[in-house]
Each structure stands twice: as structure tokens, then as C-alpha cells.
Interface confidence: medium
């Protein structure tokens, strides 16, 4: 599923991401935009043999199990395919674990490069939340 901007903002708010660990909803919508272009089925392969999955491009080396990433830790204890569902519950729950891990949203390269220090509130402007 490819979410609309406000549609995703509403879904993320429903799942408790607004101000989760101090990150406003705009940060999460911005991250999703530049990680996956709001596409729940996005997959991207990395040079280390791991793959990033879903709307928040969660990595198989650490967070989920795709059955083929050597040394996968699967810290979210889920199959990576669950992160590709049109229901973002699994991605959000795993993202909460990631953002609580110490580096905050710096874990997402796209957030660090494209969202951090910008007017992220623009990503939820005009949305009825």
C-alpha cells in the first residue's frame, strides 16, 4: 500500500508515534517519506547482504528475520515480511523498539539526512488529526 501523507500521519498517530521518545509526528512522516516514499512494500538491499523492509525501511541485520541475513539479531522478533503489510502495526511496534535503542531517530539515515533540523511539522500541516 502507498499511503497518502495525511493518511499515514493519522495512522501513525493512532499507533502512538506522536511524540514517542520525544519525536513529534512530523518526524515520523518525514522519515517514511524519504525512506520508502510512503510505500509499505518497499524493499532495498544493502551492500552488507542485509535488506531494509517496509515503510520505515527496517533492517534485517538487526531488527527482523528474513531467513537469509547472516548473523541476524531479529531484535523485534518478527519476520521481515510482516513489515510489508498494509497494516503498519508491526512496523510501528518495531520502530518504537529501534528509537528506544539509544540513537533515537538517528538510526534512520534518511531522517538524519533529510528531516533532522528541518521544519518537520510541514509534513502534517493541513492534516485533520
Amino acid at each position: 500500500k502507498v499511503f497518502g501523507r495525511c493518511e499515514l500521519a493519522a495512522a501513525m498517530k493512532r499507533h502512538g508515534l506522536d511524540n514517542y521518545r520525544g519525536y513529534s509526528l512530523g518526524n515520523w512522516v518525514c522519515a517514511a517519506k524519504f525512506e520508502s516514499n510512503f510505500n509499505t512494500q518497499a524493499t532495498n538491499r544493502n551492500t552488507d547482504g542485509s535488506t531494509d523492509y517496509g515503510i520505515l525501511q527496517i533492517n534485517s541485520r538487526w531488527w527482523c528475520n528474513d531467513g537469509r541475513t547472516p548473523g541476524s539479531r531479529n531484535l523485534c522478533n518478527i519476520p521481515c515480511s510482516a513489515l510489508l503489510s498494509s497494516d503498519i502495526t508491526a512496523s510501528v511496534n518495531c520502530a518504537k523498539k529501534i528509537v528506544s535503542d539509544g540513537n533515537g531517530m538517528n538510526a534512520w539515515v534518511a531522517w538524519r539526512n533529510r528531516c533532522k533540523g528541518t521544519d518537520v511539522q510541514a509534513w502534517i500541516r493541513g492534516c485533520r488529526l
Epitope: Q41, T43, T47, G67, R68, P70, L84
Partner: antibody
């Protein structure tokens, strides 16, 4: 137990297209990548590409882009590979395998003859 | 693409001999290398994964070693059922690639 059952041998004319199937049983089909591999005598094994049935995400070896197209039907737990514009170079045995990095589970192979 | 070079192309041995098959990668692939055996008209069978991890059900005479660019499959005291083709495959990066194979034949 995990099994991958491929469709039977095919004899096709040059220029035609063919669709090979791979039915998976014994595991959660949507969770694992299905890989496709080509084997020609004297050419060893070549990785064609892969599909994740749960999402339809696909990756192709550059060499096979435009030649192979992967699809999957999650209702029947079946992956498909279509090969188009067939030439004698496409005559080979085609395998599906479950993509665990390594390939422990393989189909029995589908022999394609283009003649 | 990562190229895998297997040597020798053919190995003629007598049952009871011990042999080593080589697989060399064009760049470092850590331990992300796997070994397969293939008999005529059969699908490949995974023997060793990630350089040295033996698969269950595979006889203990098969062992793997190596890391980086140089890998070895060893067969301690070859039996008649071991004859066939042996392939290596890397899963360090895409596209996945295979070696050209080593044919193990009876002398």
C-alpha cells in the same frame, strides 16, 4: 516438510513466451524469498533473480532484465517465472529455490527446450 | 559482480582418497560462501553453509574452511556416492553468483 514442486518440461518455438511455476508447501510462503536459477550444460548455475511473495518485491540479475518476469499467487502458494522472446540460448533447466542466503530447498527443475 | 573461480575443473580420484576443492572469490565475501553437490539429473544439494557449517544429514567426511577470498571443501576418504559436480555460491552481495564447478570423477 518444505517442498518446491515445479511445472513439467516445455518445448517452445523461438520468439514465444513460457511461464514456469513453482508451488511451495510446508512453510509460510509469504515470508521467504523465492529465487530462480538457470543451468545450462557448460555454463554452470546462474542466478536470475528473486521475488518476495508477500509483497511482490522483485530483484533481477541485470543479465535477465527484460527476459524474465516474476510473479506470485499467495492464494495458491505458487511463484511463477515468465520468459519472453525465447531463443536457443534460453534452453536450460530452470530451478526455483527458497532464498535463505544459501539454497537448502530446491525444486526438481523444469527443462525448457527452444527449438 | 563477484566472480567465483573453482579449481581444479576436474578431479580424478580413487575411493578412499582424501581431496580438497578450492573456490576463490574476486573480492572478500567474509564467510558468506556455500557448497553444493549435484548428481546428473538432480537438483543441487547443500553440503556446507557459511564457509564451514555442515548441514544436518550430510556425512561428516565433508568439511568446509576459509574466509575472505579463499575457501576449501574437503572430503575425507571419498566414497563412490560422492562422485558428481561440486559448486560454490556466494551470498555476500547481489547478484548471487556460483562457481563454474569441479567435477569429481572416478580414476
Amino acid at each position: 516438510q518444505v517442498q518446491l514442486q515445479e511445472s513439467g518440461a516445455e518445448v517452445m518455438k523461438p520468439g514465444a513466451s513460457v511461464k514456469i511455476s513453482c508451488k511451495a508447501t510446508g512453510y509460510t510462503f509469504t515470508t521467504y524469498w523465492i529465487e530462480w536459477v538457470k543451468q545450462r550444460p557448460g555454463h554452470g548455475l546462474e542466478w536470475i533473480g528473486e521475488i518476495l511473495p508477500g509483497s511482490g518485491s522483485t530483484y533481477y540479475n541485470e543479465k535477465f532484465k527484460g527476459k524474465a518476469t516474476f510473479t506470485a499467487d499467495t492464494s495458491s502458494n505458487t511463484a511463477y517465472m515468465q520468459l519472453s522472446s525465447l531463443t536457443s540460448e534460453d534452453s536450460a533447466v530452470y530451478y526455483c529455490a527458497r532464498g535463505d542466503g544459501n539454497y537448502y530447498y530446491w525444486g526438481q527443475g523444469t527443462t525448457l527446450t527452444v527449438s | 559482480d563477484i566472480e567465483l573461480t573453482q579449481s581444479p575443473a576436474t578431479l580424478s580420484v580413487t575411493p578412499g582418497d582424501s581431496v580438497s576443492l578450492s573456490c576463490r572469490a574476486s573480492q572478500s565475501i567474509s564467510n558468506n560462501l556455500h557448497w553444493y553437490q549435484q548428481k546428473p539429473h538432480e537438483s543441487p544439494r547443500l553440503l556446507i553453509k557459511y564457509g564451514s557449517q555442515s548441514m544436518s544429514g550430510i556425512p561428516s567426511r565433508f568439511s568446509g574452511s576459509g574466509s575472505g577470498t579463499d575457501f576449501t571443501l574437503s572430503i575425507n576418504s571419498v566414497e563412490t556416492e560422492d562422485f558428481g559436480m561440486y559448486f560454490c555460491q556466494q551470498s555476500n552481495s547481489w547478484p548471487r553468483t556460483f562457481g563454474g564447478g569441479t567435477k569429481l570423477e572416478i580414476k
